[in-house]
């Protein structure tokens, strides 16, 4: 790396991935290992993150970006970029203060995340239910009784069940 | 309940060696993602990590202040959780913390559950 | 490494009083960033993680805030239990912890 011959701030010629060099006459010096600047013009590189414990690495630091990390297996990114791990549970189960627990009767989870929500009251809509609910599944909506009588065809879709709840990311 | 327990701290002389151990309870130390890890506390003085080992890979990491000195291992047979002190000098003397990273059902790069501690004295 | 400087060292402070403890970070750390209360010859009890998230069982008069290199721990009502040393950790990078801030009573 040449130094830079800028009138101004001889530090702002120093590209993304490298740092201005104090101890070295203001020198472009490229970021140790395991650090990044992700901007020119920088006086220092920053450490990369670490993904350790429950995080693991989805990609790798460079010397122009931060690594990012995910969850290892079992659990659910929650936080801004991944600062938390949440652990799964199965379909039907939601996380409470001391673990997993089936959900109540007359509610559901489709994911391995969230809480668990009512079954859709298929007779506010004046439907009837078509599929009974589970813990895993929301109820199915058919058509309404008046629609069920001799020469009705085609069972009206069902009507979409609220967004899925999940936890922040 | 998650429960650490700390043993094996002790007087001894510098240069001497030790065994920590930390039995856990209330969770199992080889559960994916769940770190563990050594903190130290000189008299009088604040918290200094010392070393971890990851759940999952059982990656470890050491302070530069014991790095080629102590080693952290553990038996999940016993759900049992070391720290080999070797080559001790004065300033090892500390009371020595096992904690486990997160809490509840959430995980992440803090301490959630913390050990009563064990005195470590180095001196002759 | 990433250095935590804590201030003030020390403080005192009356029941009642609103308790302000600042934690500067050497480089950005996002919110990776934790405040434990000490003490005496206890062991440390997580008050706030990720930096604004209250553990379970931690009143709500404790508060924690910030993000990237300066974090805030706000008591905003003192009361006798509270009277500790405080220190905060980040886990950004490896492990480290402020030096600590003891609380006192005026």
């Known amino acids: 790396f040449e130094r830079t011959r800028s009138l101004q701030d001889p530090c702002s010629n120093c590209p993304a991935g490298t740092f201005c060099d104090n101890n070295r006459n203001q020198i472009c010096s490229p970021c140790p290992p395991n650090s990044f600047s992700s901007a020119g013009g920088q006086r220092t590189c920053d450490i990369c993150r670490q993904c350790k414990g429950v995080f693991r690495t989805r990609k790798e630091c460079s010397s122009t970006s931060n690594a990012e990390c995910d969850c290892t297996p079992g659990f659910h990114c929650l936080g801004a970029g991944c600062s938390m791990c949440e652990q799964d549970c199965k379909q039907g189960q939601e996380l409470t203060k001391k673990g997993c627990k089936d959900c109540c009767f007359g509610t559901f989870n489709d994911q391995k995340r969230g809480i668990c929500r009512p079954w859709t009251n298929c007779s506010l809509d004046g439907k009837s239910v078509l599929v009974n609910g589970t813990k895993e599944r929301d109820v199915v909506c058919g058509p309404s009784p008046a629609d069920l009588s001799p020469g009705a065809s085609s069972v009206t879709p069902p009507a979409p069940a609220r967004e899925p709840g999940h936890s922040p990311q | 309940e998650v429960q650490l327990v700390e043993s094996g701290g002790g007087l001894v002389q510098p240069g001497g060696s030790l065994r920590l151990s930390c039995a856990a309870s209330?969770?199992?130390?080889?559960?994916?993602?769940?770190?563990v890890a050594w903190i130290r506390q000189a008299p009088g003085k604040g918290l200094e990590w010392v070393s971890s080992?990851?759940?999952?890979?059982?990656?470890?990491y050491y302070a530069d202040s014991v790095k080629g000195r102590f080693t952290i291992s553990r038996d999940n047979s016993k759900n049992t959780l070391y720290l080999q002190l070797n080559s001790l000098r004065a300033e090892d003397t500390a009371v020595y913390y096992c904690?486990?990273?997160?809490?509840?059902?959430?995980?992440?790069?803090?301490?959630?559950?913390w050990g009563q501690g064990t005195l470590v004295t180095v001196s002759s | 490494d990433i250095q935590l400087t804590q201030s003030p060292s020390s403080l005192s402070a009356s029941v009642g009083d609103r308790v302000t403890i600042t934690c500067q970070a050497s480089?950005?750390?996002?919110?990776?960033l934790a405040w434990y209360q000490q003490k005496p010859g206890k062991a440390p009890k997580l008050l706030i993680y990720?930096?604004?998230n209250r553990a379970t069982g931690i009143p709500s008069r404790f508060s924690g805030s910030g993000s990237g290199t300066d974090f805030t721990l706000t008591i905003s009502s003192l009361q006798p239990e509270d009277f500790a040393t405080y220190y905060c950790?980040?886990?950004?990078?490896?492990?480290?912890f402020g030096q600590g801030t003891k609380v006192e009573i005026k």
């Open positions: 209330g969770f199992s130390l080889s559960t994916g993602g769940v770190g």
């Open positions: 904690a486990r990273e997160g809490s509840d059902a959430v995980l992440g790069d803090w301490f959630g559950y």
């Open positions: 080992i990851s759940g999952y890979g059982s990656t470890t």
């Open positions: 480089q950005d750390i996002t919110t990776y």
């Open positions: 950790q980040q886990g950004y990078y490896l492990w480290t």
């Open positions: 990720d930096a604004s």
